[in-house]
């Protein structure tokens, strides 16, 4: 309506404050100056606006900054961030970790939305790599963040950042991701002593090769079954019965309960039944006595 386009007398906003909370859509549009809004964005988050009112405020900022908001505005978006689309966010250049934290805080309690995923992507790309402080921040808000990255993206994580990773951050990682993360973890923790090293490296072992598992078996680490079951099958198969016994220590008894599941099932099929019997667990399915085992892969390699 034409008469609603002009700001009514006495309603022009001199500052962003709670006097605006009951303004109608058209009043906000007509009476709030976009430049004033941009300089006082930090106040918006302390005022209970309806979503409809937030839409009007966003529209004002969009008109003021058609190429994307400056970081000074982004950092104080607060609740208004929930109104942004991934397309809006792709126009931003977010470089400050404080800005990232402020926006993640707004989204706390929600699942990782497309908006947040876009924000993180923009931020990480802008930094060039996933440094320790960023990773610390992201995994604090989203424990599963690391496992949402592709192996290619994970390759940009510097070994120093691995110190920020907690075991629960790796819960949903698949073997391809752990293949990338394990060598970084090994490098990051290389100066630690045996027992401390094992505590730190344990959650990354799903990416460990056979030779590293053999080395661990010599260190009395007492690996639990849950960790063992997450090891790469191809890394477990070459281990001898004696090596697995040393690797698991007192947890070796748990093999019986897992004998039908990979990698235990496949490992049993590769062992001599005689050797399995030495464990006294009643594991069945090993290679019968008197049978010759040919390693065809080795034969092919030689030819």
């Amino acid at each position: 309506e034409v008469e609603k386009t002009a700001c009514p007398s006495g309603k022009k906003a001199r500052e962003i404050d709670e006097s605006l909370i009951f303004y109608k859509k058209w009043e906000l549009e007509a009476c709030v100056d976009a430049a004033l809004l941009a300089t006082q964005m930090d106040r918006v988050n302390a005022i209970p606006f309806t979503y409809e009112q937030l839409d009007v405020l966003k529209h004002k900022l969009d008109e003021l900054y058609p190429q994307g908001y400056p970081e000074s505005v982004i950092q104080h978006l607060g609740y208004l961030f929930l109104k942004m689309s991934p397309e809006d966010i792709r126009k931003w250049n977010v470089t400050s970790l404080e800005t990232l934290k402020a926006l993640l805080e707004v989204n706390k309690g929600h699942e990782m939305s497309p908006q947040v995923a876009t924000l993180i992507d923009r931020f990480v790309k802008g930094r060039g790599q996933l440094d320790k402080d960023t990773l610390d921040t992201l995994t604090a808000f989203y424990p599963g963040y690391l496992c949402s990255l592709s192996p290619e993206e994970l390759s940009s994580v510097p070994p120093s950042s691995i110190w920020a990773v907690r075991p629960q951050d790796l819960d949903t990682c698949d073997p391809r991701q752990l293949d990338v993360l394990y060598p970084k973890a090994r490098l990051a923790f290389q100066n630690m002593n045996g027992s401390e090293y094992f505590v730190k490296i344990q959650s990354f072992l799903g990416g460990a090769p056979t030779e590293d598992l053999k080395a661990l078996s010599q260190q009395n680490v007492s690996m639990d079954l849950a960790t063992f079951m997450k090891l790469r099958t191809d890394a477990v198969l070459p281990l001898t019965v004696a090596e697995v016994q040393k690797l698991l220590g007192p947890h070796v008894e748990g093999l019986k309960a897992e004998e039908r599941h990979r990698p235990v099932r496949d490992w049993i099929l590769r062992q001599r039944q005689d050797d399995l019997d030495t464990l006294g667990l009643g594991l069945q399915g090993g290679i019968p006595n008197g049978y010759l085992v040919l390693d065809l892969s080795m034969q092919e390699a030689l030819s």
């Epitope: 605006l20 009951f22 209970p48 606006f49 979503y51």
Partner: antibody, heavy 119, light 106 residues
Framework: EVQLLESGGGLVQPGGSLRLSCAAS????????MSWVRQAPGKGLEWVSA????????YYADSVKGRFTISRDNSKNTLYLQMNSLRAEDTAVYYC????????????WGRGTLVTVSS | IQLTQSPSSLSASVGDRVTITCRAS??????LAWYQQKPGKAPKLLIY???SLESGVPSRFSGSGSGTDFTLTISSLQPEDFATYYC?????????FGGGTKVEIK
């Protein structure tokens, strides 16, 4: 303890007046917008009125506009609802409710006070 | 904006999964809250922003939806969950509530 406690309800004749009070404690009262929400016997919830933290801005549902006045005294941590020209349909339990910091839902409610308008 | 809750009442047993829906007469983004009210008591906030769980509320309660259709789910009904549930929109003024859904013991 964070709480809201209403008082002032009672039996009043049609056309009469009543003033409800809501005493707040355990939070910085002046920092939050506040509301009155009512519930007629056996019915649902109806938003009646709201007021900004400073008391400078108010809002009323069409059903009470011109008859009810919301106000607050931040020095006493108290919210008020002055109800005039009461009608039978205003009979309800009136709840005082704290508005969340930056969005219009209610994260704290009082126990309510019953207003009965009857001759 | 009108909010229509369905069903208006339902009977369920302890351990059941219960779903209540709230439909808005026009789009309200995710500006929706859910409350629980027991007889003679004040409403209690359960969910805000359509899916965010209020602090201290058991995780068996969850909310979903956006736009016009919203759902409150109780994954495994407990004895203390028998009550009336209301949705409320805060997309625009006037704020409005749904008519309520009473959850009774079967």
């Amino acid at each position: 303890e964070v709480q809201l406690l209403e008082s002032g309800g009672g039996l009043v004749q049609p056309g009469g007046s009543l003033r409800l009070s809501c005493a707040a404690s355990g939070f910085t009262f002046s920092s939050y917008a506040m509301s009155w929400v009512r519930q007629a016997p056996g019915k649902g919830l109806e938003w009646v009125s709201a007021i900004s933290g400073s008391g400078g801005s108010t809002y009323y549902a069409d059903s009470v506009k011109g008859r009810f006045t919301i106000s607050r005294d931040n020095s006493k941590n108290t919210l008020y609802l002055q109800m005039n020209s009461l009608r039978a349909e205003d009979t309800a339990v009136y709840y005082c409710a704290k508005v969340f910091a930056n969005s219009w839902y209610f994260d704290l409610w009082g126990r309510g006070t019953l207003v009965t308008v009857s001759s | 904006i009108q909010l229509t809750q369905s069903p208006s009442s339902l009977s369920a047993s302890v351990g059941d999964r219960v779903t209540i829906t709230c439909r808005a007469s026009q789009g309200i983004s995710s500006a929706l809250a859910w409350y629980q009210q027991k007889p003679g008591k004040a409403p209690k906030l359960l969910i805000y922003d359509a899916s965010s769980l209020e602090s201290g509320v058991p995780s068996r309660f969850s909310g979903s939806g956006s736009g016009t259709d919203f759902t409150l789910t109780i994954s495994s009904l407990q004895p203390e969950d028998f009550a009336t549930y209301y949705c409320q929109q805060f997309n625009n003024y006037p704020l409005t509530f749904g008519g309520g859904t009473k959850v009774e013991i079967k």
